[in-house]
Amino acid sequence: AKLGAVYTEGGFVEGVNKKLGLLGDSVDIFKGIPFAAPTKALENPQPHPGWQGTLKAKNFKKRCLQATITQDSTYGDEDCLYLNIWVPQGRKQVSRDLPVMIWIYGGAFLMGSGHGANFLNNYLYDGEEIATRGNVIVVTFNYRVGPLGFLSTGDANLPGNYGLRDQHMAIAWVKRNIAAFGGDPNNITLFGESAGGASVSLQTLSPYNKGLIRRAISQSGVALSPWVIQKNPLFWAKKVAEKVGCPVGDAARMAQCLKVTDPRALTLAYKVPLAGLEYPMLHYVGFVPVIDGDFIPADPINLYANAADIDYIAGTNNMDGHIFASIDMPAINKGNKKVTEEDFYKLVSEFTITKGLRGAKTTFDVYTESWAQDPSQENKKKTVVDFETDVLFLVPTEIALAQHRANAKSAKTYAYLFSHPSRMPVYPKWVGADHADDIQYVFGKPFATPTGYRPQDRTVSKAMIAYWTNFAKTGDPNMGDSAVPTHWEPYTTENSGYLEITKKMGSSSMKRSLRTNFLRYWTLTYLALPTVTDQEATPVPPTGDSEATPVPPTGDSETAPVPPTGDSGAPPVPPTGDSGAPPVPPTGDSGAPPVPPTGDSGAPPVPPTGDSGAPPVPPTGDSGAPPVPPTGDSGAPPVPPTGDAGPPPVPPTGDSGAPPVPPTGDSGAPPVTPTGDSETAPVPPTGDSGAPPVPPTGDSEAAPVPPTDDSKEAQMPAVIRF
């Protein structure tokens, strides 16, 4: 069967029907359907005016305008808001009421596209394998990235979050139109990786999506990840404004000027340096979502009541931090180079700057405890990777899972850890699953391009597609049309259970309490440390005028250290795109092509791409109860400060409303709220906060949409902000 022309709100569209073998099965493929009008720079997306006749939807459209990997030119287009649909068809009747899976790509909110990199004429985000193997409709789409998607003055002049609003427009378009393609508009699952996983999470929390989303999967990225929310957007907006010659003294004039500036100039005004970094690499990603008081009405930690009816899977890769650690400390991947205690201490101190000497020393001690027993370079390098994995991915994911569970009504929660090792031939043997390694298996690459893969890779891919599509159908990854290798138990606050995804899966794959000591450290011990003063927190200013070196952070406001965005001649951005591709220069509009397999290693065609999404991680405590973030009563306003902040601030460390603290022991006691920068143990909230939007337990009647005025709503930091 085949669909033929389909009538949508924009008009008729016609795709391609691709036959799948001799049994008569096929897949209808639609590429390049507009879901919004061509964009205007730094404006919200608008509905598409439609067309007459039948739109031939047979080719991917260009990605949204973005810098190339080398950051010296742009590719893509401002006219980029298009989506792609794969609809599986049986032999006789056209499909009806199929579950719908909408993919959101990663790329550090800086790069990427709905189709991903092209390798052997197969695009990374080609939905055919998922659609046909799982009998679901797959949708991918483009959204604006970089300054054009996320530049903000932190006020009404340029509220930001344009890329998130693009994503919402695509989701709403699917809801309104997918029935015509044979989809069930009441069974939409979002899934995404890295910045895409965080976007999935943010979309479930936004009041704009009420009633649109049934289920969600965050792979290596959640809303609470420390790189997701920009707390000082004005700093970054001014950096770009200065570069393109716009006035910076008055936000309204600056905004007007930026809106009429050549979008290519805006895009190239922001560069991510990659060498001579004063701070860890991810602190240089400046154009990301903001708390705008509208689309994201409050700190994400306070919005989980909005996701109370959405089934949720979240997980991380066991070495998600590897690519970032190898950028921050290049010796990690070099057999002939050593990681020293001094190197690691420096890295730790850069992440823990607002806790001063004590923060650095305590963290260093916790992570190097094993070094006395095993001083091998392999162990030391693994420690560095574990450290970045914990901070950027595992801990925030754990908190997100606990928060979802605590607020869920009928919704289910599942956690996973993806551990199938990276197939990058240039990596040391000890490297596990790097950031973005999971994508190729979810999208069925071992089946689509079999020559690059081994049977065990097909086993992993088959299992992941089965779990993911079963979940999309039923809300339970074990139940659906696809057989699974073992039973995946839900995550609960009692069991802290997670499924470890590997090539051999059985009953022992269901595990509990991942990295307990480290989760406890970050959510209890570290947070209780006092925040140091500005002088103590400020490092010695860098010398020289290279724009690659960030201004030293000042103050203890709620932002990560913000480096400059200059055109420093810094090396190109790491492969953080949607492609899962190594740093090979991009070709055409396809994204950087992945390194082909070399020798007999069977290296996969899609290596990791460091697009920085933080995957959710199951609870790691052996405490029984995972950390349920409190909702606090800090009274911080829902809109970030819009003042002329000057140099980039240091991220806060607990004097502004601290991140959640997991209960200890098996007491089942409620979570305690940290109380500022005192050295005493945090005390439980007293409940006089004026009804925070997200209660610590899921049975509350809290309104799903938090206030957007300047009320005293709780504003907890999204995660440990270092």
Partner: antibody, heavy 119, light 105 residues
């Protein structure tokens, strides 16, 4: 100027079929979709379906699938709507209506054709 | 399908009055359109894309809204404005509101 002229009133028995025509003039016939909307006596408007005159592609409201067929004749710039298995509740005024532009509203309407279904 | 709920279903007003009719969609929509229909006549396009007026429609008619809530306003009723008004959304399965009958008080 744009004109849509529909065929005259029809009286049909239950179980029969009716075919209503809509002749377009004043614009390029193949450049705009044509919709059919009906209105039962004293009731509101109900969308039935749409046809793209350039390639004959159609889409029908779920309620009418299997009973309605829309066709066009480009040589005479005419679209047709045939409704089969008529029942008394199909008694209504049937309108053809042309898109205004893009995915726009229905900017131009025929005068309507009353179809009465009675035994 | 997307449901459209118009209110009120009928209303009485006098010449010169300001009148407002609302239409709520069961989910967020891209565009809302409004039609005027007089007895025995075909509907006539009044407002398109929420707030735009086709040529020939008097400026006393205006439309506003986005997402799920939309409004048609007649700033100063004229005798020829007494009619039935329909809202209309264009998803892949277009639907109309049930109509608002505007009568002379």
């Amino acid at each position: 100027q744009v004109q849509l002229v529909q065929s005259g009133a029809e009286v049909k028995k239950p179980g029969a079929s009716v075919k209503v025509s809509c002749k377009a003039s004043g614009y390029t016939f193949t450049s705009y979709n044509m919709h059919w909307v009906r209105q039962a006596p004293g009731q509101g408007l109900e969308w039935m379906g749409v046809i793209n005159p350039s390639d004959g592609a159609t889409s029908y409201a779920q309620k009418f699938k299997g009973r309605v067929t829309m066709t066009r004749d480009t040589s005479t710039s005419t679209v047709y709507m045939e409704l089969s298995s008529l029942r008394s509740e199909d008694t209504a005024v049937y309108y053809c209506a042309r898109d205004y532009y893009g995915s726009s509203p229905l900017g131009y309407w025929g005068q309507g054709t009353l179809v009465t279904v009675s035994s | 399908d997307i449901q459209m709920t118009q209110s009120p279903s009928s209303l009485s007003a006098s010449v010169g009055d300001r009148v407002t009719i609302t239409c709520r969609a069961s989910q967020s929509i891209s565009y809302m359109h409004w039609y005027q229909q007089k007895p025995g006549k075909a509907p006539k396009l009044l407002i398109y894309a929420a707030s735009k007026l086709p040529s020939g429609v008097p400026s006393r008619f205006s439309g506003s809204g986005s997402g799920t809530d939309f409004t048609l306003t007649i700033s100063s009723l004229q005798p020829e404005d007494f009619a039935t008004y329909y809202c209309h959304q264009r998803s892949s399965s277009p639907t109309f509101g049930q109509g608002t009958k505007l009568e002379i008080k």
